[in-house]
């Protein structure tokens, strides 16, 4: 008797068993009692990723430049086209559609990740003990100079924008 | 429900060639399957000449060494078949089939 | 050309009793996606072919379940479990795997 339901990489029609089409091909007509499924390569724009039935292949994804995107992965007939972000830019989605530029940590955070093509910097706040006193996309949080190893005192204390102000020690005293 | 029906002259004579039409009803001959050409000679059994696809696409049974043509007009939901250089070994029962319908056949007698 | 041996060629089974008729391929009819396309007609006297098997094993639309077919590779089987008079005709198998497709020489049954 007819089946009702049909092996993995199989799929039922017209009470037929018939073969899915391998990943990079599309259906061109179902088996019948009497032949296979037919299938047909994707053109070289386009791909299919999984066992499939589909009759039309998908378009890879385009990198547009425009939009600041550009290749990281061509596509093939079984995998799609992966974009990335030009230099200086990063996604905006896991999907990557468009860029938008890396943020700068201000003064008082420095970097505590530089961008990616598809992340954004991570700032971290500058901890006692370290300063940051510019707005950069690359700049960590530096260190408070330590007065002592140059023989001096500390003038003026530091800030988490600031660095201290070091000064001679008083010899008067 | 599908139907098959074959339609042509009953005699031809030999060296001429052979023409038949077959008309399908209840599915397109371009949706699926493939359209065949079958037949018998009196008493004997099954022969297989060729058949024309859903596609337009052709087979043909090497042993008629290239005497047959399978075509189809889409329009009508036909497909036809030509025999050429006919003797009186051709003379059989043809049928057109989709393999699961057959038509009912027609007598092709080749004589002069 | 895949030549297709039937036997017997024919036999004559009392009614109500079982008949049992072969078929074998002289090369394997599987194709690299592991299906087999062999089916099994019954031509009753006067009568175009009838599919009663496809696929080596499914009975078409309206068979009665008393026709079963197994088999794989090279080796065919029509078994049908209890004769009734209708039954009678040519029985043939059909090879559509590979191109040319390709009849067996047929089995005539009878009653008894």
């Known amino acids: 008797e007819p089946p009702t339901a049909c092996r993995e990489k199989q799929y039922l029609i017209n009470s037929q068993c018939c073969s899915l089409c391998q990943p990079g091909q599309k259906l061109v007509s179902d088996c019948t009692e009497f032949t296979e499924t037919e299938c047909l390569p994707c053109s070289e724009s386009e791909f299919l990723d999984t066992w499939n039935r589909e009759t039309r292949c998908h378009q890879h994804k385009y990198c547009d430049p425009n939009l600041g995107l550009q290749v990281q992965q061509k596509g093939t007939s079984e995998t799609d086209t992966i974009c990335t972000c030009e230099e200086g830019l990063h996604c905006t989605s896991e999907s990557c559609e468009s860029c938008v530029p890396h943020r700068s940590c201000l003064p008082g955070f420095g970097v505590k990740q530089i961008a990616t093509g598809v992340s954004d910097t991570i700032c971290e706040p500058c901890p006692v003990g370290f300063f940051s006193n510019v707005s950069s996309a690359f700049e960590k949080c530096r260190p408070w100079t330590s007065c002592e190893t140059k023989d001096l005192v500390v003038q003026q204390a530091g800030t988490n924008k600031t660095d201290v102000v070091c000064g001679p020690q008083d010899r008067q005293r | 429900e599908v139907q098959l029906q074959e339609s042509g002259p009953g005699l031809v004579k030999p060296s001429e060639t052979l023409s038949l039409t077959c008309t399908v009803s209840g599915y397109s001959i371009t949706s699926n399957y493939y359209w065949n050409w079958i037949r018998q000679p009196p008493g004997k059994g099954l022969e297989w000449m060729g058949y024309i696809r859903y596609d337009g696409s052709n087979n043909y049974n090497p042993s008629l060494k290239n005497r047959v043509t399978i075509s189809r007009d889409t329009s009508k939901n036909q497909f036809s078949l030509k025999l050429s250089s006919v003797t009186a070994a051709d003379t059989a029962v043809y049928y057109c089939a989709r393999l699961d319908y057959w038509g009912q056949g027609t007598t092709v007698t080749v004589s002069s | 050309d895949v030549v297709m041996t039937q036997t017997p060629l024919s036999l004559s089974v009392t009614p109500g009793q079982p008949a049992s008729i072969s078929c074998r391929s002289s090369?394997?009819?599987?194709?690299?996606?592991?299906?087999?396309?062999l089916n099994w007609y019954l031509q009753k006297p006067g009568q175009s072919p009838q599919l009663l098997i496809y696929?080596?094993?499914n009975r078409f639309s309206g068979v009665p379940d008393r026709f079963s077919g197994s088999g794989s590779g090279t080796d065919f089987t029509l078994k049908i479990s209890r004769v009734e008079a209708e039954d009678v005709g040519v029985y043939y198998c059909?090879?559509?795997?590979?191109?040319?497709?390709?009849f067996g020489q047929g089995t005539k049954l009878e009653i008894k």
């Open positions: 696929r080596v094993s």
């Open positions: 090369q394997s009819l599987e194709n690299t996606n592991g299906n087999t396309f």
């Open positions: 059909l090879q559509v795997t590979h191109v040319p497709f390709t």
